[in-house]
C-alpha cells in the first residue's frame, strides 16, 4: 500500500521557475515505481508541479506548507 | 496548425527491429511531451510510453519496457520509436501524441493531437 | 493498473437522439478522467478533458459529468459525424489507461 504522502503519479522533468509558494495548497512524493524522484506541489488552481526533492527552494515550500498544515503530510 | 507527421507503413519479419518517427510541427517542440500509443486491430488505445522532448526522459508502462525504446531529436523536432524483437502481436497501429509540459506530474497527461498513425505488419 | 469499464458495448441511436456513455474506474480517480472520439481509419480526437472541460473546436453538444468512479459523456442530439468508437482515458496513476471503447453506431 502507498504511504499516506505518496502520490500515484511520475515526474519527467522538474519544474525550473519559481515555486509559487503562497498559491501551493499540498504536496507529494511521486511512486518509488517511478523512474525519476520528485515532489509534487499541488497549486490552487489544481496544477501539479514536479520538483527536484533536493532542490534548496523546494524543501523551503515543503516547510512552509508543513507549518501551514500544523505539520502534517498531505493526503494525496 | 499544430501536426504531428508520422512515418509510413511497416512490412517486416518476426525478429527484426523497426524505428517509427513522428515530427512535430506548428508549435514549440520541446514545451511539450510526447507519448506513444498501440491500437491493434478493432481493440482500444494502449499507453507505451512517454517521453521528455527537452531531456529524453522517459517513463514506459511496464510490459513494453523491454520492446519498444523512445528517443527524440530536438534539431529536427522529431520523435522516435524502436520495436525489437517483433512478434505477430506487435503487429499495430502506433500514434504518437502530444501531452503536457513535462514538468506537470502525470495526472495532466491527455493527449490533445495525435499523429495519423504508423501501421507496423508482421509477417513472415 | 486501474481498469475502465465503458458500458453500453454498443449504442444504436437515431439522428436527432440524446444519448450517455459511461465510464467506470475501479478505483478513485478524481477527476483525472479524458474522453475521446475515434473515427474508422482516423486518429483519435479529444473531446472532453478533467470530466467536463471542453476543448476548443468540439462542438457544444458534447459535455462530461462524474467524479471519482462514475463518468458520463453526454452527446445532446446525436448527428451523422458523431457515429464511431468513444473511449474513456484516465490520468491519476500510473501507467495512463483507456476504456475498452462503446461503438456509437446507425439504429
Known amino acids: 500500500a502507498r504511504g499516506t504522502n505518496v502520490g500515484r503519479e511520475c515526474c519527467l522533468e522538474y519544474f525550473k521557475g519559481a515555486i509559487p509558494i503562497s498559491r501551493l495548497t499540498r504536496w507529494y512524493k511521486t511512486s518509488g515505481e517511478c523512474p525519476k524522484d520528485a515532489i509534487v506541489f499541488v497549486t490552487v488552481q489544481g496544477k501539479s508541479i514536479c520538483s527536484d526533492p533536493k532542490d534548496k527552494r523546494v524543501k523551503k515550500a515543503v516547510r512552509y506548507l508543513q507549518r501551514t498544515w500544523k505539520g502534517g503530510p498531505q493526503e494525496s | 496548425q499544430v501536426q504531428l507527421q508520422q512515418s509510413g507503413p511497416e512490412v517486416v519479419r518476426p525478429g527484426v527491429s523497426v524505428k517509427i518517427s513522428c515530427k512535430g510541427s506548428g508549435y514549440t517542440f520541446t514545451d511539450y511531451a510526447m507519448h506513444w500509443v498501440k491500437q491493434s486491430h478493432a481493440k482500444s488505445p494502449e499507453w507505451i510510453g512517454v517521453?521528455?522532448?527537452?531531456?529524453?526522459?522517459?517513463i514506459y508502462k511496464q510490459k513494453f519496457k523491454d520492446k519498444a525504446t523512445m528517443t527524440v531529436d530536438k534539431s529536427s523536432s522529431t520523435a522516435y520509436m524502436e520495436l525489437a524483437r517483433l512478434t505477430s502481436e506487435d503487429s499495430a497501429i502506433y500514434y504518437c501524441?502530444?501531452?503536457?509540459?513535462?514538468?506537470?506530474?502525470?495526472?495532466?497527461?491527455?493527449?490533445?493531437?495525435w499523429g495519423a498513425g504508423t501501421t507496423v505488419t508482421v509477417s513472415s | 493498473d486501474i481498469v475502465l469499464t465503458q458500458s453500453p458495448a454498443t449504442l444504436s441511436v437515431t439522428p436527432g437522439d440524446s444519448v450517455s456513455l459511461s465510464c467506470r474506474a475501479s478505483q478513485s480517480i478524481s477527476n483525472n478522467l479524458h474522453w475521446y472520439q475515434q473515427k474508422s481509419h482516423e486518429s483519435p480526437r479529444l473531446l472532453i478533458k478533467?470530466?467536463?472541460q471542453s476543448i476548443s473546436g468540439i462542438p457544444s453538444r458534447f459535455s462530461g459529468s462524474g467524479s471519482g468512479t462514475d463518468f458520463t459523456l453526454s452527446i445532446n442530439s446525436v448527428e451523422t459525424e458523431d457515429f464511431g468508437m468513444y473511449f474513456c482515458?484516465?490520468?491519476?496513476?500510473?501507467?495512463?489507461?483507456f476504456g475498452a471503447g462503446t461503438k456509437l453506431e446507425l439504429k
Open positions: 482515458q484516465q490520468s491519476d496513476s500510473w501507467p495512463l489507461t
Open positions: 501524441a502530444r501531452g503536457r509540459p513535462d514538468y506537470y506530474g502525470s495526472s495532466h497527461w491527455y493527449f490533445d493531437v
Open positions: 517521453i521528455s522532448t527537452n531531456s529524453g526522459n522517459a
Open positions: 478533467y470530466t467536463s
